[in-house]
């Protein structure tokens, strides 16, 4: 694959991933009510990073924002932070990578500058993708922990329930936003790697490309019996050649969206 194609593809993949990260961050379905082996309710609960929602059987949906910072679990705050970091880095990565694209000419920017920018954007996309993946994974781990705790509470101490009032705990399982976040983070990461690979193709390799000039202090004259004079003078007119290794350049890494916090 040519460097231009690699860089362009990396940019597109990262862009798609970045959009996915934003989408995941804004989605309300980070966790959804678990319906398996539960009494069937006419109310469906789901939660995001920023608000929780309830949908009734009529379709009426009511969402309430988490209007507190201090009252929220530290893990939720951490997930929010990771997703926001992913988005911010993705934005910067996209801006940098636009100027780094080989197909775009800006002033007299040479290839070495574009190579550096490509590498920078690639690294930004990689970190953005990793940040989103970690954020989503932390949230998923939180859900799993709470799910099994809820399950244990549901089935423990219910042996002698004669006359007792049951309270059914709402359990939450993985919502669509988690899968969107994982895929988006992965795409952003892959796009970032592709940008880094493309950078290699844009960078002149010293060992391969540097033209060395050998200057004689005087003129090298070799007297031979036949009076033949040979002079050697390499370098002054030798051109520096840039070789493109065809490494695919990575595109903008997809930026991960801060995922919505679901109350679990």
């Amino acid at each position: 694959m040519s460097v231009t194609a690699c860089q362009g593809l990396g940019f597109v993949v990262s862009l798609i991933g970045f959009a996915g990260i934003i989408a995941a961050t804004c989605m309300d379905q980070w966790s959804t009510q678990d319906l398996y082996n539960n009494p069937v309710t006419a109310v469906f609960n789901y939660q995001g990073l920023w608000r929780s929602c309830v949908r009734e059987s009529s379709g009426f949906t009511e969402c309430r924002g988490y209007f507190t910072l201090l009252g929220l679990p530290a893990m939720l705050q951490a997930v929010r932070a990771l997703m926001i970091v992913g988005i911010v880095l993705g934005v910067i990565g996209i801006l940098v990578s636009i100027f780094a694209l080989k197909c775009i000419r800006i002033g007299s920017m040479d290839d070495s500058a574009k190579a550096k920018m490509t590498l920078t954007s690639g690294i930004l996309f990689i970190i953005s993708g990793i940040s989103a993946i970690i954020g989503v994974s932390v949230f998923a781990n939180m859900l799993v922990t709470n799910f099994w705790m809820s399950t244990a509470n549901m089935y423990s101490g219910m042996g002698g329930m004669g006359g007792m009032v049951q309270t059914v705990q709402t359990r939450y399982t993985f919502g669509a936003a988690l899968f969107v976040g994982w895929v988006a983070g992965g795409l952003t990461l892959i796009g970032g790697v592709m940008m880094c690979i493309a950078c290699r193709g844009l960078t002149p390799d010293d060992s391969n490309f540097k033209a060395v000039s050998y200057h004689a202090s005087g003129q090298n004259v070799a007297y031979r019996p036949g009076g033949f004079k040979a002079s050697t003078g390499f370098g002054s007119n030798t051109r520096n050649k840039k070789i493109y290794d065809g490494g695919a350049r990575t595109e903008d890494d997809e930026q991960s969206h801060p995922t919505k916090y679901d109350y679990v």
Partner: antibody
Framework: QVQLQQSGAELVRPGASVKMSCKAS????????MHWVKQAPRQGLEWIGT????????SYNQKFKGKATLTVDKSSSTAYMQLSSLTSEDSAVYFC????????????WGQGTTLTVSS | DIQMTQSPSSLTVTAGEKVTMSCKSS????????????LTWYQQKPGQPPKLLIY???TRESGVPDRFTGSGSGTDFTLTISSVQAEDLAVYYC?????????FGSGTKLEIK
């Protein structure tokens, strides 16, 4: 205004089937659930099931599965309930009721269809 | 299925009196997601279909007189009529609107002296 007009009283033999109707008017039929409720003589209310006319999705009370079948005809804005293998236990007044937008309530009710199962 | 228990089964009062009737559910009807109780109250007058009075345990349906008040949370609920009128003669049913199948209480019959 919202109205639910139910079909007239039915007198049927044990073992037979009956299909009663509930014609809706005054609102968008496909946007609200339609519920069916049984009230046996001098008894309380029993929820039979619900159907969403928009896509035909149904949810039944386990007790009435196999006994009641809920359907709709969108073109005439009419909901139907068929009761099969009738016995004297099925003698009751059957109401259709629209699912309210809030609180999973039943906000408008038909006048009821009286079913008498007798030999 | 959720059991709904209403008490008393009947009561007789004079016009203008305050009336309170109770409804208990076998499981909590409080949804943690929105902190709403999915309990509904209906009024059924003789020879008529039921009429929606209150949903979400305490929200009056439009057109319902403000003498009807619903309260309670979790498993214990109350319907209060602040000043009974002759037209309030009816059977009052509470309904679980949270779990399928929806279930109704056996009703409280209100009679006027």
């Amino acid at each position: 205004q919202v109205q639910l007009q139910q079909s007239g009283a039915e007198l049927v033999r044990p073992g037979a089937s009956v299909k009663m109707s509930c014609k809706a008017s005054g609102y968008t039929f496909t946007s609200y659930n339609m519920h069916w409720v049984k009230q046996a003589p001098r008894q309380g209310l029993e929820w039979i099931g619900t159907i969403y006319p928009g896509n035909g999705d149904t949810s039944y009370n386990q007790k009435f599965k196999g006994k009641a079948t809920l359907t709709v005809d969108k073109s005439s804005s009419t909901a139907y309930m068929q009761l099969s293998s009738l016995t004297s236990e099925d003698s009751a007044v059957y109401f259709c009721a629209r699912g309210g937008y809030y609180g999973n309530s039943l906000d408008y009710w038909g006048q009821g269809t009286t079913l008498t199962v007798s030999s | 299925d959720i059991q709904m228990t209403q008490s008393p089964s009947s009561l007789t009062v004079t016009a203008g009196e305050k009336v309170t009737m109770s409804c208990k559910s076998s499981q909590s009807l409080l949804n943690s997601g929105n902190q709403k109780n999915y309990l509904t109250w209906y009024q059924q007058k003789p020879g008529q279909p039921p009429k929606l009075l209150i949903y979400w345990a305490s929200t009056r349906e439009s057109g319902v007189p403000d003498r009807f008040t619903g309260s309670g949370s979790g498993t214990d609920f109350t319907l209060t009529i602040s000043s009974v009128q002759a037209e309030d003669l009816a059977v009052y049913y509470c309904q679980n609107a949270y779990y399928y199948p929806f279930t109704f209480g056996s009703g409280t019959k209100l009679e006027i002296k």
